[in-house]
Interface confidence: low
């Protein structure tokens, strides 16, 4: 049936709305800075490294490289930094900044991602003395995403960018269920159209099981809201057990009286005020 | 401009002691380990001993192990080397560098200060 | 301790001529962070030395592109091209990967 495609077109208009950030993030308008920050968005599954690379220009001789992450207050809390002379790491070690051989290029990454790293990243360069200078790259935003198990052979895999986001999830669910009224009108006009006298009360039988086993129709029966909660929870969930990485616990800020959502996680490092991290010296005579 | 000025050298008997002092300016001394290098008259570079920035991690070539003592005032931007049980050996030019293991590494070099170890 | 092996020890050029220098290290100067530390140093008499290039490649700020590094694991090479006079010095490599540091005995670089 012709119908069947009737809510993809809707998701696929919806994804392609979902880049909109990207375009701000890319806009031809911004001001040339001499640092990048690459890729300007990027998604990937809980428990997946995500790894963004910072570009200097040309090679300085004294700086210092700072990644931050824009907090829910715009204010820019420091998740670790590289030193001509050391790797500074964070308080939380998942952040990990590493020089590329070219010398210009640094990888910024952070091990085992979390649904609540979501967010928006920049990285800072300070130019030391006798040229003093400070520069900071383009936001780049970073979403990561709720492990799904592997669907069922007969289920059609999610559409990319919708799991774990809420509202990319409501319209998905949405346009399924719109699907399936068109469907149910279809069978309706179609119904109406044949005469039922040759096949009698079976024909609407017949043409409804169909409707429940189909693929398209899949999401509606299975989807358990409670898997949408996520958002809201408190506390990072546990993905499931053949899926979990095995990782260090780390503790997270709850900000009581309000959701927890991705935009708002406090990273231990941004607790830190004033007081630097403690030292760490590069390859050579002390490996980290 | 990154500066690093050694003083300190000087003749001394062997059994002797002497304490180099390296001031640094031009950045952030407290970012940065230090190292002194030394190169014995017309022979190559040795690294002697290092520092972290903290002072908290050192390290010492085997053969002034237990002689030699690196430490650093970070408020004062200076590093020092003690040297004692001086052996005629230890006769050389020693330099002062920054960086201690390091991309950047052996970046900038003081003028160094020459001691002599003689009877 | 890493051995630095460098050739020739002496080497004498003309001006206008290109002249390479051999650095060989008895393990590999990689790093698991993909960067290679080797530098390149000259000193000139009476005078400290000056760094030239690190990791293996990178000029150090006002050294003109006359200097080229290359080079990879063990075996690195250091061309001066267009030699002229100022050129002349002794020239180290050394690696700042393992402990301790080590350099090269020195290339004595003279002008013919």
């Known amino acids: 049936m012709g119908s069947r495609r009737g809510p993809w077109p809707l998701v696929w208009a919806v994804l392609q709305l979902g880049w909109w950030p990207g375009w701000l993030l890319d806009s031809p308008d911004r001001p040339w800075s001499p640092l990048t920050f690459s890729p300007a968005q990027l998604t990937v599954q809980e428990g997946e490294n995500a790894t963004f690379t910072c570009s200097l220009a040309d090679i300085p001789d004294s700086f210092v490289l700072n990644w931050y992450r824009l907090s829910p207050r715009n204010q820019t809390d420091k998740l670790a930094a590289f030193q001509e002379d050391r790797i500074e790491p964070g308080r939380d070690r998942r952040f990990r900044v590493t020089r590329l051989p070219n010398g210009r290029d640094f990888h910024m990454s952070i091990v085992a991602a979390r649904l609540n790293d979501s967010g928006i990243y920049l990285c800072g360069a300070i130019y030391l003395p006798p040229n003093t200078q400070i520069n900071e790259s383009p936001r780049a935003e970073l979403s990561v995403t709720e492990r799904t198990l592997e669907p069922p052979t007969q289920s059609p895999s999610p559409p990319p960018r919708l799991s774990g986001q809420l509202q990319g999830l409501v319209i998905g669910v949405t346009s399924v269920l719109v699907g399936v009224l068109l469907l149910l009108l279809l069978t309706w006009v179609l119904a109406a159209v044949f005469p039922r006298a040759t096949r009698g009360a079976c024909v609407c039988g017949s043409e409804d099981e169909p409707l429940k086993e189909g693929p398209d129709a899949a999401p509606v029966f299975t989807l358990d809201y409670g898997e949408l909660d996520f958002q809201w929870r408190e506390k990072t969930p546990e993905p499931p057990a053949p899926c979990a990485p095995e990782q260090t616990e780390y503790a997270t800020i709850v900000f009581p009286g309000r959701p927890a959502s991705p935009g708002r996680r406090a990273s231990a490092s941004s607790l830190q005020g004033a007081q630097p991290p403690s030292p760490e010296d590069g390859p050579g005579l002390w490996p980290p | 401009e990154v500066q690093l000025v050694e003083s300190g050298g000087d003749l001394v008997k062997p059994a002797g002691s002497l304490r180099l002092s390296c001031l640094a300016s031009?950045?952030?001394?407290?970012?940065?380990?230090m190292s002194w290098v030394r190169q014995a008259p017309e022979k190559g570079l040795h690294l002697v001993a290092g520092?972290?920035?903290?002072?908290?991690?050192?390290y010492y070539k085997d053969a002034v192990k237990g002689r030699f003592t690196i430490s650093r005032d970070n408020a004062k931007s200076i590093v020092y080397l003690q040297m004692n049980s001086l052996r005629v050996e230890d006769t050389a030019m020693y330099y002062c560098?920054?960086?201690?293991?390091?991309?950047?590494?052996?970046?900038?070099w003081g003028q160094g200060t020459l001691v002599t170890v003689s009877s | 301790d890493v051995v630095m092996t460098q050739t020739p020890l002496s080497l004498s050029v003309s001006p206008g001529e290109t002249a390479s220098i051999s650095c060989k290290a008895s393990?590999?100067?990689?790093?698991?962070?993909?960067?290679?530390?080797l530098t390149w140093f000259r000193q000139k008499p009476g005078q400290s030395p000056h760094r030239l290039v690190y990791?293996?490649?990178h000029r150090h700020p006002g050294v003109p592109d006359r200097f080229s590094g290359s080079g990879s694991g063990t075996d690195f090479t250091l061309r001066i091209s267009r030699v002229e006079a100022d050129d002349t010095g002794l020239y180290y490599c050394?690696?700042?990967?393992?402990?301790?540091?080590?350099f090269g005995a020195g290339t004595k670089v003279e002008l013919k």
């Open positions: 560098v920054r960086g201690f293991s390091s991309f950047n590494g052996l970046g900038y």
């Open positions: 520092i972290n920035s903290d002072g908290d991690r050192t």
């Open positions: 031009g950045f952030t001394f407290s970012s940065y380990s």
């Open positions: 050394g690696q700042v990967i393992h402990d301790p540091w080590t």
């Open positions: 393990q590999s100067l990689l790093h698991s962070d993909g960067n290679t530390y």
């Open positions: 990791a293996v490649s």
